[in-house]
Interface confidence: low
Amino acid sequence: EDWQCPRTPYAASRDFDVKYVVPSFSAGGLVQAMVTYEGDRNESAVFVAIRNRLHVLGPDLKSVQSLATGPAGDPGCQTCAACGPGPHGPPGDTDTKVLVLDPALPALVSCGSSLQGRCFLHDLEPQGTAVHLAAPACLFSAHHNRPDDCPDCVASPLGTRVTVVEQGQASYFYVASSLDAAVAASFSPRSVSIRRLKADASGFAPGFVALSVLPKHLVSYSIEYVHSFHTGAFVYFLTVQPASVTDDPSALHTRLARLSATEPELGDYRELVLDCRFAPKRRRRGAPEGGQPYPVLRVAHSAPVGAQLATELSIAEGQEVLFGVFVTGKDGGPGVGPNSVVCAFPIDLLDTLIDEGVERCCESPVHPGLRRGLDFFQSPSFCPNPPGLEALSPNTSCRHFPLLVSSSFSRVDLFNGLLGPVQVTALYVTRLDNVTVAHMGTMDGRILQVELVRSLNYLLYVSNFSLGDSGQPVQRDVSRLGDHLLFASGDQVFQVPIQGPGCRHFLTCGRCLRAWHFMGCGWCGNMCGQQKECPGSWQQDHCPPKLTEFHPHSGPLRGSTRLTLCGSNFYLHPSGLVPEGTHQVTVGQSPCRPLPKDSSKLRPVPRKDFVEEFECELEPLGTQAVGPTNVSLTVTNMPPGKHFRVDGTSVLRGFSFMEPVLIAVQPLFGPRAGGTCLTLEGQSLSVGTSRAVLVNGTECLLARVSEGQLLCATPPGATVASVPLSLQVGGAQVPGSWTFQYRED
């Protein structure tokens, strides 16, 4: 059996335990919300909310300003004071539920759990490259708001998502809040509403449009709003909610709600079920057909995609795609598949599906039994009838009422289950060159930056590193500031470069120079780094070969040895074809002649493993001495590969030249029929890669080989006679004169 180089796991070319220190800010309490601002005059800021406090940070994460947002009723509460003399409601801590930018003004809007969920508007005042908050305006008009009708009650203590849209000269707040019976009874926040900010910043205009979970369903039907965003002509909310009003409320699924961003109306409110699955390449027995469902959305982000992923999704480069991380249930506990899966939903396809659903409901021929749905918001009805009505009246349109699209949008895990045990808790997607990168935070406080690509069976990591030592979960909301992303974990905010924190986790030159161009990695003699880390020796154009092992470890001083070298960066071409004169191997002083690669031995190597083999024929020079020596591989004049060219020398110790010695042979006679078990004793009999015992020129079949002993079975003899017996190692005869006598059987 030919000796084969041991496989090197792909993971051996990187080390995810390398420590990276990224800029951070300690907020003094659990981070509840975070948002960034970039002005058009190079000024920027990071706003970080914790319980009862709002921090303003500069682009370097240094504190610029801090504002007390609670407790309500406390004389030190700076935002409360903006609402005039109190009391304004029950005293209590302020947990920030909403922190958004109104880009039109520009201003920061914060809404908390206290004071009926009212909001405060903070004008932004640029000061050099930093930004300060002006005195807050209280977005609450006491005379406009009643417990049963409160346009200025925005935030729910159970959670609220807000997206701000400019329409004409006005700012509209698209608000989605989680409700229960207790919350709904106190100043009646709505499930979904569109509220116009009054020009004088005294609150929101009354008479706003809204949808709310019907009182009879409030106890059993809770909707969690996970994410909201605005793209094109629509605002989208992503929800996790019971799959049915009537069935088990713990059977959850994910929906996308779409609202018009151009008309502040809810007549064209649409919902679509998003179905994300893990569909392993080989389905386990008993696994559901179509894949294992991951119905619960944990985090989401929408972003334009790079060319490569766009091709995979059959959409144009730069088109917007909604990415979601899904889990099997609320606890996200382990099932048979991975803990987290990532599904991609192109926005254009979402819109097409929704529009087709509207056609199905409202266009002839009518599909009998097709429900309008959303029975938790409105009275049940069948298409094309409006909610609660048996028929369309002449002056109403089927299209002007909310609708749940009857078909779901199904996708499978982009990562093919490769996230495995990782529990993803944060997601932000960016486009770098033509690559689409998912920046993910995890339950154990790590950041994974991974290329989003479908067709591989391994993850393409930009980085995978720990944010700090606390190991606390990375929080859901991520913000971008310039070329950095801001992640929150525990009471800390971390600033992570979108290009990755560095290159030191790439351990080999080959892996280093194969890294994405945007990472700026280069090789610095023996480590991978960015140019600023090692300006002297940094280069991006070549890698030396790397010898990791060879076989055998010894060879005869006279005679040849077939030497197999193992390592990486020998060829750069999977075929292993070597141009003439590029590879020079020496063992001690002796050259080792490269052998052509035997294509019948080429084995497909899975990308998760890698190894390169190089074979050469070693014929020691006459001047070569017995004893230990080095194996040296030098590669020069190789044509460049896709990422770099191979150039340089690798040396490995541990080869020994030995002189085999034959001391004894027994028995010295045997039957002419052959089959006598010969024992040859000596030293260094197993060196090299070939040996042969010849009885009268015919090979004696070797049964066992060890350093001090060879066993072989004699071939048949032509006649009864004494014949020469010799041992060859590496094709050269071992000194000594021996005879074997064939006798009658």
Partner: antibody, heavy 121, light 107 residues
Framework: EVQLVESGGGLVQPGGSLRLSCAAS????????MSWVRQAPGKGLEWVSE????????NYAPSVKGRFTISRDNAKNSLYLQMNSLRAEDTAVYYC??????????????WGQGTTVTVSS | DIQLTQSQSFVSTSVGDRVTVTCRAS??????LVWYQQKPGKSPKTLIY???FLYSGVPSRFSGSGSGTEFTLTISSVQPEDFADYFC?????????FGGGTKVEIK
């Protein structure tokens, strides 16, 4: 413009071998799954085999498994089908087709003009 | 293997008519179904994928519907260039399979 040009078809005896080639141009070949589909004279379409962009995932129709081998050379923008142990029922027009990359859809969106394989003694 | 049955081998119609071609799967294929058009001596052309999505460049008179096991291709107003063979194909399971085809011909 996407172009797929098949070649290598011809008349071959039962038990014989043939190698079909497909030259691709007008798109990034190395990013697409590629397929072979055949159509017997006067009959419908039959999927034969497919290969993913980096050749790590390959699927075959049961009728050709063990006899046909699909391969690709991304450097040459070429797709191949090595057909061994050919039978009379393998007689067909063989189309090279590109897979739609709308996420994971297995639809073919571009087809070559086809090359004819006739297996007859 | 999943069998796809196109029960009508031929559909005779006139220019301007609405025509439907059906395809039935022997087991649930979700929405993993595509429709192709093929003219004599030519290679197939993709019309609809994912059961109902119009492939780019295909006229809007073509539409697809259905999911699970029953699928329909509709041409709302047949044009002279639409007389051809139409095949469905599923890609929910391996092996990928095609329907036997339906020829839309001039009445």
């Amino acid at each position: 413009e996407v172009q797929l040009v098949e070649s290598g078809g011809g008349l071959v005896q039962p038990g014989g071998s043939l190698r079909l080639s497909c030259a691709a141009s007008g798109f990034t070949f190395s990013r697409h799954w590629m397929s072979w589909v055949r159509q017997a004279p006067g009959k419908g379409l039959e999927w034969v085999s497919e290969i993913n962009p980096d050749s790590r995932t390959i699927n075959y129709a049961p009728s050709v498994k063990g006899r046909f081998t699909i391969s690709r050379d991304n450097a040459k923008n070429s797709l191949y089908l090595q057909m061994n142990s050919l039978r009379a029922e393998d007689t067909a027009v063989y189309y090279c087709a590109r897979r739609v990359r709308i996420h994971y859809y297995g639809a073919m969106d571009s087809w070559g003009q086809g090359t004819t394989v006739t297996v007859s003694s | 293997d999943i069998q796809l049955t196109q029960s009508q081998s031929f559909v005779s119609t006139s220019v301007g008519d609405r025509v439907t071609v059906t395809c039935r799967a022997s087991q649930n294929v979700g929405s993993s179904l595509v429709w192709y058009q093929q003219k004599p001596g030519k290679s197939p052309k993709t019309l609809i994928y994912s059961a109902s999505f119009l492939y780019s460049g295909v006229p809007s008179r073509f539409s697809g519907s259905g999911s699970g096991t029953e699928f329909t291709l509709t041409i709302s107003s047949v044009q002279p260039e639409d007389f051809a063979d139409y095949f469905c194909q599923q890609y929910n399971n391996y092996p990928l399979t095609f329907g036997g085809g339906t020829k839309v011909e001039i009445k």
